[in-house]
């Protein structure tokens, strides 16, 4: 990634699962912005395994990394741990925009690719091109990630690279899903990690004159029960106009069976909430996860008595989550009048 | 605090067999692969085993394989090795450590150690 | 058995820069991160430094390590008495099955 402004990774939102390291290509004295974890609980960020501080030129701060103005020695490797876990949720390495190194972390420029190369002499025995992305042996990383194994190489004669598991020869055949074996970039690719998928990984890399190799180590941590997660922002808060049709929607991750519900808020003798200090509420929709379209509620030809707080429930073995939405119903008559709703609620 | 607190260690005599623990506090141990190191009186650090964080991957040194089972609870925070067919050269100081992603593998954190000798 | 060699000793007078050496092979420093632990009189070892002089909170920079190819060294300069303890380097090794093996030990006296 180059950018000729500042570079940001991604809005402070939920990391993704994806543990693939990043390489990112920073001109000098350009603003750097990375995220990591939602702000109000961002991961901690480190470089070459220092954590860093929350104030200075180059700082980590409620889930960010900035770093006001590139310098050359600001390039290294950043890592950013979930608060109070060894757990990766970034995994990046950033270089000065001069550098030779590739800004893409598929691509060597190293690799000596050039079939004219191939037979020039000196022959060279195998050697690591790029150590500093090999430095990771020890590997634990949920199931259903994707994990690359890298050993990026070259030598004359151009080497070739093969993977064995546990010494074996490993081709993927017998794992579902397969493997993707991408000599060019000296990568395996195993996608939907599972526990069966744990063991030492080695990559040979060889060639006429001599052989390297490098052995990492997987685990593949089962997934923990856990009460049903909703995706953040849904259901939105939505503004309709009298005798429109409305869709709310909601999704819904949950690894034991969830029971989803739609609930709608509602007044009783002028109060929202109950002597037990419980809202009102009338059950719209009930279903498993498995029902179809149980994730949307569905709302025909809108009055305004339909205006107001509607929440999507989703319960398991584990627990309950639940989030709010608003919905706001405008007279037919002045479509371009807009009420303020309040903002929706949400739960973790 | 960060702590590793070994336990089990003693007397046996050759041929027997000896259950060492160490109890981690201060961290998440379910996150963290974990290993074992001994050293003979007067020498120097020998490797025994690591563990994975699930427990479902471990590696000997060619030394115990075979003789030796690391194994850990993590429900209990605890780590174990469970040591057969012990030999005069297994007596040692036993540590349990803790093997750190953010110190590239190495392994950061130290229990005080258990002595095991084995004798007749 | 060691993989990785190290001198049985080495000293120095308070304030002088001493260097360790560690030499391993193309399996094991020349692959993989070296690690350098520290251990004092009648304790257990501690991580020293790390990787490309990268240190646990604690230790000071006084402690600096370098690597070239299958050989890697730790240098103390401005030794201090507190310094006196047995240095031991390790490495993570590829050699058919990966495994973790530490140098024979260095024991540094501060004259």
């Known amino acids: 990634l180059e950018a000729s402004e500042e570079v940001e990774l991604e809005p402070c939102l939920a990391p993704s699962l994806e543990q693939q390291e990043q390489e990112l290509t920073v001109a000098l004295g350009q603003p750097v912005r990375l995220c990591c974890g939602r702000a109000e609980r961002g991961g901690h960020w480190y470089k070459e395994g220092s954590r860093l501080a929350p104030a200075g030129r180059v700082r980590g701060w409620r889930g960010r990394l900035e770093i006001a103005s590139f310098l050359p020695e600001d390039a290294g490797r950043y890592l950013c741990l979930a608060r109070g876990s060894m757990i990766v949720l970034q995994n990046l390495t950033l270089i000065t925009g001069d550098s030779l190194t590739s800004s893409n972390d598929d691509e060597d420029p190293k690799s000596h690719r050039d079939p004219s190369n191939r037979h020039s002499y000196p022959q060279q025995a195998p050697y690591w091109t790029h150590p500093q992305r090999m430095e990771k042996k020890l590997h634990a990383v949920p199931a259903g990630n994707t994990v690359k194994f890298r050993c990026p190489a070259a030598g004359n004669p151009t080497p070739t690279i093969r993977w064995l598991k546990d010494g074996q020869a490993f081709h993927g055949e017998n794992r579902i899903g397969g493997i993707r074996l991408r000599h060019q970039h000296w990568s395996l690719v195993m996608e939907s990690v599972v526990p069966s998928d744990r063991g030492t990984y080695t990559c040979l890399v060889e060639n006429a004159v001599g052989s390297i190799r490098y052995n990492y180590l997987l685990d593949v941590l089962e997934r923990s029960p856990h009460r049903p997660i909703l995706q953040a922002g849904l259901p939105a808060n939505t503004t309709a106009v009298v005798g429109s049709d409305v869709e709310l929607l909601c999704k819904v991750y949950s690894d034991a069976q969830p029971h989803i519900q739609w609930l709608k808020h509602i007044v009783i003798n002028g109060s929202s909430f109950g002597a037990d200090g419980f809202p009102y509420v009338q059950v719209l929709k009930t279903a498993d996860i498995n029902s179809s379209e149980v994730e949307v509620l569905y709302l025909r030809n809108v009055s305004a008595e339909d205006a107001g707080e509607y929440t999507c429930l989703a319960g398991n073995s584990i627990g309950l989550s639940y989030q709010s939405a608003w919905l706001t119903v405008l007279p037919e008559e002045d479509p371009t009048w807009t009420a303020a709703a309040p903002e929706a609620r949400y739960t973790d | 605090e960060v702590q590793l607190l070994e336990s089990g260690g003693g007397l046996v005599q050759p041929g027997g067999s000896l259950r060492l623990s160490c109890a981690a506090s201060?961290?998440?141990?379910?996150?963290?692969?974990m290993g074992w190191v001994r050293q003979a009186p007067g020498k120097g650090l020998e490797w025994v085993s690591v563990?994975?964080?699930?427990?479902?991957?471990?590696i000997y040194a060619d030394s115990v394989k075979g003789r030796f089972t690391i194994s850990r609870d993590n429900s209990k925070n605890t780590l174990y090795l469970q040591m057969n067919s012990l030999r005069a050269e297994d007596t040692a100081v036993y540590y349990c450590a803790r093997s750190s992603g953010w110190a590239l593998d190495a392994f950061d954190i130290w229990g005080q150690g258990t002595m095991v000798t084995v004798s007749s | 058995q060691y993989e990785l060699t190290q001198p049985p000793s080495a000293s120095g007078t308070p304030g002088q820069r001493v260097t360790i050496s560690c030499s391993g092979s193309?399996?094991?420093?020349?692959?993989?991160?070296v690690h350098w632990y520290q251990q004092l009189p009648g304790t257990a070892p501690k991580l020293l430094i790390y990787?490309?002089?990268q240190r646990p909170s604690g230790v000071p920079d006084r402690f600096s390590v370098s690597k070239s190819g299958s050989s890697a060294s730790l240098a103390i300069s401005g030794l201090q008495s507190e310094d006196e303890a047995d240095y031991y380097c390790a490495s993570w090794d590829d050699s058919l099955k990966a495994f973790y093996v530490f140098g024979t030990g260095t024991k540094v006296t501060v004259l």
């Open positions: 201060g961290f998440t141990f379910s996150h963290y692969w």
């Open positions: 193309s399996s094991n420093i020349g692959s993989n991160i």
């Open positions: 990787g490309n002089n």
């Open positions: 563990i994975s964080p699930s427990g479902g991957l471990t």
